[in-house]
Amino acid sequence: FERTRSLQDPCSNCPAGTFCDNNRNQICSPCPPNSFSSAGGQRTCDICRQCKGVFRTRKECSSTSNAECDCTPGFHCLGAGCSMCEQDCKQGQELTKKGCKDCCFGTFNDQKRGICRPWTNCSLDGKSVLVNGTKERDVVCGPSPADLSPGASSVTPPAPAREPGHSPQ
C-alpha cells in the first residue's frame, strides 16, 4: 500500500531543499530564503535557526540543512545541538547562581566548566600524598608510606608479628 501511494503522490518526488507546493498544483518549489528541508517529500520547509546574541553561527543554514550554533568566547554549549550557552569559569572555580566561585578547600576543578570535586583520598588506597592538591589540581598519590623509605616505618603502626620467612603483603 505504501509503495502504491508513493507512486501516486507527486510530493514524494520533491527532493530535499524543496517543498511540495499545494498552491501551485503540487509542484516542487525551492525552499524560500532562511528555510530548509532536510528530507524529500516535505509539504513545508522549516525555518532556519538563528544564532543570536551569545550564540554564534558555526555552520550557515542551507536549503537542505539547518544552521548550527556554538557559543561566543567565555561560554560553552549545553544541551542537544547547543540549545544553551553557559558561562565559563576559571580553573579552580565552579558556576553558582551568583556567578563563578572559588572551589572550597579540599576540592578542585581543572576545567572551565563543571563543579568542584573532592581531592582524592590517597589513604583509601593505602597510599600517601606525594603532591598536595590545589583549587585547580587534584592531589597526586604516591607509594604507600611503608614503601617510601626504611625510616618510614616509624610513622606507621607496627605490623603484627609474623612467622619468620613471611614478608609483609
Epitope: R49, K52, G53, V54, F55, C69, F75, L78, C82, S83, M84, C85, E86, Q87, L95, K97, K98, G99
Partner: nanobody, 121 residues
C-alpha cells in the same frame, strides 16, 4: 509584539560618556536577567555585563570594570548601561539579551538588534 530594543548609541570622544537603554515590550523585564554584549568590526562577540532579575546584582567583564555600570528600572521595563571614560576599543555594536539567569542563555531568549557606539576624536 515581544521585543527588546537598544538605544542611546552614537559618536563620542575618548574619555566621554554614553548611556545605553535596553527597553522591553510585550513582556515583563523584571522577570529576566539582562546581559549586554558587544561586537566590534572583525572581532568576536564579547560579553560586557549582566544584571540579575532577583537582587539586581551586577557582573562585568574585566575590560569594562570600574567604567561601566548596569542598572534597571522595572517600572519603565528598561535596563541601562552607563558607560564612562570611553576608549576607542569600546567601539562596537552593543546588544542586550534577556536570559532567565546571567550564567546561562537559551536559544529562545529574547535579543535586541543592537546600537552602534563609536569612540573617536
Amino acid at each position: 509584539q515581544v521585543q527588546l530594543q537598544e538605544s542611546g548609541g552614537g559618536l563620542v570622544q575618548p574619555g566621554g560618556s554614553l548611556r545605553l537603554s535596553c527597553a522591553a515590550s510585550g513582556f515583563s523585564l523584571g522577570l529576566y536577567a539582562i546581559g549586554w554584549f558587544r561586537q566590534a568590526p572583525g572581532k568576536e562577540r564579547e560579553w560586557v555585563s549582566c544584571i540579575m532579575s532577583s537582587d539586581s546584582s551586577a557582573y562585568y567583564a574585566d575590560s569594562v570594570k570600574g567604567r561601566f555600570t548596569v542598572s534597571r528600572d522595572n517600572a519603565k521595563n528598561t535596563v541601562y548601561l552607563q558607560m564612562t571614560n570611553l576608549k576607542p576599543e569600546d567601539t562596537a555594536v552593543y546588544l542586550c539579551g534577556a536570559p532567565r539567569d546571567c550564567s546561562r542563555y537559551s536559544s529562545d531568549d529574547y535579543w535586541g538588534q543592537g546600537t552602534q557606539v563609536t569612540v573617536s576624536s
